[in-house]
Interface confidence: medium
C-alpha cells in the first residue's frame, strides 16, 4: 500500500510548473513526474518527444490530467504543487486502473475456497500478531463475499504472504525503508495472488510505523483481483492513510468492487444451519441452492430438502431429497429441465446426475467436464434450459457458458460475463429457472429477479420465497 518511488528530489516546487522549465529543480520534478506517470498511469516515455525538456503534443499533459482526475485533484494538466505533493505521497505501487475497479484483464479466483500461507515472519512483530493481522485482513473480504480463506502451513497455497527486502525475485525490487512498502499480484497460478511486504519497513499493530493489517487489507484486495479505487474513502484508494483499526470498515466502493467479481455472501453462509434442520419457508432471508421446473411443478432445492410447488397453486410441500432419490447427495447446486425429453439434470461439485421421468439414470454421476467445461470449472452455480433456442445456460461465478443441446456441444465464444449480457443481473447466481415462455427467474440470496429474455432486462424484483405465498 504505502509505496513511494525513489525520490529524485525531496523538495517540492511551489506553484504550477509549465513543462518547458529549465531550472534543475523543475527539471527534476518533471523527471520525477515522468517516472511516476510511467509507473502508475502507463505513460510511455519513449514516445515523448523531448528537446530541452519541451514536450510536443499532449501526452504528458493528458497523463497528468488522468492522474489528477483519478486522485481527486483539480484537473489542470500541470505539475502544480498539489499534484507534486500527491506524487510524493505514500501510496501503493500497483498501477492505477481507471474507472473499472478490477485489475487489468480482470482475473478472478475461479473458486471460493482459497488458501494462504505465510512464507516467513517479520521480526518487527510477534508471530501471533502477524498471524492475527493477516487473518483479520482476509476476514474483511470474506465478510462481504462468498469467499472462504484458510491458512495452511505447508505446501502450495493460492496466496503466499512474503516479507522480503530489496530484489526478491519478481522484478519489482523493494527500495529500503520509506519507499515501496508492499505489492501484490492479481489472481493466477505461480506468483499470482501473492502479497509481498517490504522487510525494510517497520511493521506494527498500531499507528506507529506501518500498520500491517491495513496494508494487508489493501494488498489482499489486489490478490483477489481488485485494482485501485478513485474513492478517497476506499481501502483500495492508492494512497496510504492510517485509520483506527478497531473501527475500520470497507467503503461502499470496495464492497461494490469485490462483489462485482464474486457476488455477495450467500444467505446460508451468513446464517448457517448447523443441524441441517428444515429451513423456515417464509424466512425473509431464505435462499435456494437450485431451482428447476419439472413438468408443471417447480422444485426448490436447499441443503438436504426440496420444496415442490405445483404451478399456479399456493400449496407447497417439503421433502428430503433422499426420500425421492436415495442415490443423490444433499446440497444440489444447480438444476435444469429439458421438458420435451422428460429429463432433469442435477449438479453438485464437478458431477452431475440425469433424472429421466423422475427416475435417476444408471451410470451416473458423470463429470461436468463431459459438457466441455475447462478444467478450472469445479462446480456449476446455476443452469437453465431455454426451449426456444434449445440452449442451456450454465452460470459459473461471474461468467456463463451456452450449451447446444441438439449438437451436444458448447457454443463457441463462451464464457461471457454475466453482467455484460444479462442487464442488471450481478455475478454469482444461486439458482435460475425458465417459465412462462419468456422469463428467467434468477435467484441471488433472498432476492429473485424476473428477467424478460426478449426485452433483455429485469421486469420484476421479488423475494426468493415469493412463490410460496409468504
Amino acid at each position: 500500500m504505502k509505496f513511494l518511488l525513489i525520490l529524485l528530489l525531496q523538495a517540492t516546487a511551489s506553484g504550477a510548473l509549465p513543462l518547458n522549465s529549465s531550472t534543475s529543480l523543475e527539471k527534476n520534478n518533471v523527471l520525477f513526474g515522468e517516472r511516476y506517470l510511467e509507473k502508475f498511469y502507463g505513460l510511455e516515455i519513449n514516445k515523448l518527444p523531448v528537446t530541452k525538456m519541451k514536450y510536443s503534443g499532449n501526452l504528458m499533459k493528458e497523463k497528468i490530467q488522468e492522474m489528477q482526475h483519478f486522485l481527486g485533484l483539480k484537473v489542470t494538466g500541470q505539475l502544480d504543487t498539489s499534484t507534486l505533493e500527491m506524487m510524493h505521497a505514500p501510496r501503493c505501487g500497483v498501477p492505477d486502473v481507471h474507472h473499472f475497479r478490477e485489475m487489468p484483464g480482470g482475473p478472478v479466483w475461479r473458486k471460493h475456497y482459497i488458501t494462504y500461507r505465510i512464507n516467513n515472519y517479520t521480526p518487527d512483530m510477534n508471530r501471533e500478531d502477524v498471524d492475527y493481522a493477516i487473518r483479520k485482513a482476509f476476514q474483511v473480504w470474506s465478510n462481504v463475499t462468498p469467499l472462504k480463506f484458510s491458512k495452511i502451513n505447508t505446501g502450495m497455497a493460492d496466496i503466499l504472504v512474503v516479507f522480503a527486502r530489496g530484489a526478491h525475485g519478481d522484478f519489482h525490487a523493494f527500495d529500503g525503508k520509506g519507499g515501496i512498502l508492499a505489492h501484490a499480484f492479481g489472481p493466477g497460478s505461480g506468483i499470482g495472488g501473492d502479497a509481498h511486504f517490504d522487510e525494510d519497513e517497520f511493521w506494527t499493530t498500531h499507528s506507529g510505523g506501518t500498520n500491517l493489517f491495513l496494508t494487508a487489507v489493501h494488498e489482499i484486495g489486489h490478490s483477489l483481483g481488485l485494482g485501485h479505487s478513485s474513492d478517497p474513502k476506499a481501502v483500495m484508494f492508492p494512497t496510504y492513510k492510517y485509520v483506527d483499526i478497531n473501527t475500520f470498515r470497507l467503503s461502499a466502493d470496495d464492497i461494490r468492487g469485490i462483489q462485482s467479481l464474486y457476488g455477495d455472501p450467500k444467505e446460508n453462509q451468513r446464517l448457517p444451519n448447523p443441524d441441517n434442520s428444515e429451513p423456515a419457508l417464509c424466512d425473509p432471508n431464505l435462499s435456494f441452492d437450485a431451482v428447476t421446473t419439472v413438468g408443471n411443478k417447480i422444485f426448490f432445492f436447499k441443503d438436504r430438502f426440496f420444496w415442490l410447488k405445483v404451478s399456479e397453486r399456493p400449496k407447497t410441500s417439503v421433502n428430503l431429497i433422499s426420500s425421492l432419490w436415495p442415490t443423490l447427495p444433499s446440497g444440489i447446486e444447480a438444476a435444469y429441465e429439458i421438458e420435451a425429453r422428460n429429463q432433469v439434470f442435477l449438479f453438485k461439485d464437478d458431477k452431475y446426475w440425469l433424472i429421466s421421468n423422475l427416475r435417476p439414470e444408471p451410470n451416473y454421476p458423470k463429470s461436468i467436464h463431459s459438457f466441455g467445461f475447462p478444467n478450472f470449472v469445479k462446480k456449476i452455480d446455476a443452469a437453465v434450459f431455454n426451449p426456444r433456442f434449445y440452449r442451456t445456460y450454465f452460470f459459473v461465478d461471474n461468467q456463463y457458458w451456452r450449451y447446444d443441446e441438439r449438437r451436444q456441444m458448447m457454443d463457441p465464444g463462451y464464457p461471457k460475463l454475466i453482467t455484460k449480457n444479462f442487464q442488471g443481473i450481478g455475478p454469482k447466481i444461486d439458482a435460475v429457472f425458465y417459465s412462462k415462455n419468456k422469463y428467467y427467474y434468477f435467484f441471488q440470496g433472498s432476492n429473485q429477479f424476473e428477467y424478460d429474455f426478449l426485452l433483455q432486462r429485469i421486469t420484476k424484483t421479488l423475494k426468493s420465497n415469493s412463490w410460496f405465498g409468504c
Epitope: 483539480k74 484537473v75 489542470t76 481507471h98 474507472h99 474513492d231 461502499a252 461494490r256 442487464q423
Partner: antibody, heavy 124, light 108 residues
Framework: EVQLLESGGGLVQPGGSLRLSCAAS????????MTWVRQAPGKGLEWVSY????????VYADSVKGRFTISRDNSKNTLYLQMNSLRAEDTAVYYC?????????????????WGQGTTVTVSS | DIQMTQSPATLSLSPGERATLSCRAS??????LAWYQQKPGQAPRLLIY???NRATGIPARFSGSGSGTDFTLTISSLEPEDFAVYYC??????????FGGGTKVEIK
C-alpha cells in the same frame, strides 16, 4: 434504452430547500460518473456538480458550494441534488447527465446522456 | 477558471449551407473540448468530444477541429433539424467544467 428522468423541481421561496432526483435505467448506473447541469431561463448551460461512481467523490461549482449536496443511491439507480438556502439566481432547468469516460484514459470526455430536465423556480 | 467564448452569437443560414462555429478558450485546453447541440425545450446532446471525435450516432456532416485555444465546429450542409443552439465545453482544467455562451444557428 438508456434513460435519465429528473423529478423534484417546483416553486420555492428564497432560503428554502428542494431535493431533485434523477432515476437512471437501461445501464449499469453504479459504473458511471454523474453530473448536474443547469440552465437559467434564456441563458446558457452551467455545470453545477459532479459525483464519482461510488459516491465517494463529489465536486461543486463555486456558485453552489456549501449550499448544494450531490449524492447517489446505487441500489436504487438514483442520483440526487439537495439544494438548500436557495436564491433567485438558482432559478433554472436542472439536468442530470451521465459522464462518459475514455476507455483508455478514464478521463471524462463528455456528457452523452441527459435527462429531460426539471424546473426549479426560486421566487417570493 | 477557464473562460470559453463562442462566436458569432447568432448565425443566420439557409438549409444546405455550410455553418462554421467558433469557440475560444482563455488559455490552452489542449484537445479537451466537447460540442453540444440543444433544441428548444430539449436537453443538450453531445456531438463532438476531444475536439474532433463524433459521439455515437452523430451524422458525418458534423465535424470538429482545433486544439489549444481555438476550436471550430463545422456543419457541412445544414439540414432543417440542425437549426439549434450549439455550446462548447472544456474539461482540461476543472473544477469547474465550463461552457461557452452558445451560438444560435437560425434559418435565414
Amino acid at each position: 434504452e438508456v434513460q435519465l428522468l429528473e423529478s423534484g423541481g417546483g416553486l420555492v421561496q428564497p432560503g428554502g430547500s428542494l431535493r431533485l432526483s434523477c432515476a437512471a435505467s437501461g445501464f449499469t448506473f453504479s459504473w458511471y460518473e454523474m453530473t448536474w447541469v443547469r440552465q437559467a431561463p434564456g441563458k446558457g448551460l452551467e455545470w453545477v456538480s459532479y459525483i464519482g461512481p461510488s459516491g465517494g467523490r463529489t465536486v461543486y461549482a463555486d456558485s453552489v458550494k456549501g449550499r448544494f449536496t450531490i449524492s447517489r443511491d446505487n441500489s436504487k439507480n438514483t442520483l440526487y441534488l439537495q439544494m438548500n438556502s436557495l436564491r433567485a439566481e438558482d432559478t433554472a432547468v436542472y439536468y442530470c447527465a451521465l459522464v462518459s469516460q475514455g476507455e483508455i484514459s478514464g478521463l471524462p470526455y463528455g456528457m452523452d446522456v441527459w435527462g429531460q430536465g426539471t424546473t426549479v423556480t426560486v421566487s417570493s | 477558471d477557464i473562460q470559453m467564448t463562442q462566436s458569432p452569437a447568432t448565425l443566420s443560414l439557409s438549409p444546405g449551407e455550410r455553418a462554421t462555429l467558433s469557440c475560444r478558450a482563455s488559455q490552452s485546453v489542449s484537445s479537451n473540448l466537447a460540442w453540444y447541440q440543444q433544441k428548444p425545450g430539449q436537453a443538450p446532446r453531445l456531438l463532438i468530444y476531444d475536439a474532433s471525435n463524433r459521439a455515437t450516432g452523430i451524422p458525418a456532416r458534423f465535424s470538429g477541429s482545433g486544439s489549444g485555444t481555438d476550436f471550430t465546429l463545422t456543419i457541412s450542409s445544414l439540414e432543417p433539424e440542425d437549426f439549434a443552439v450549439y455550446y462548447c465545453q472544456q474539461r482540461s482544467n476543472w473544477p469547474p467544467l465550463t461552457f461557452g455562451g452558445g451560438t444560435k444557428v437560425e434559418i435565414k
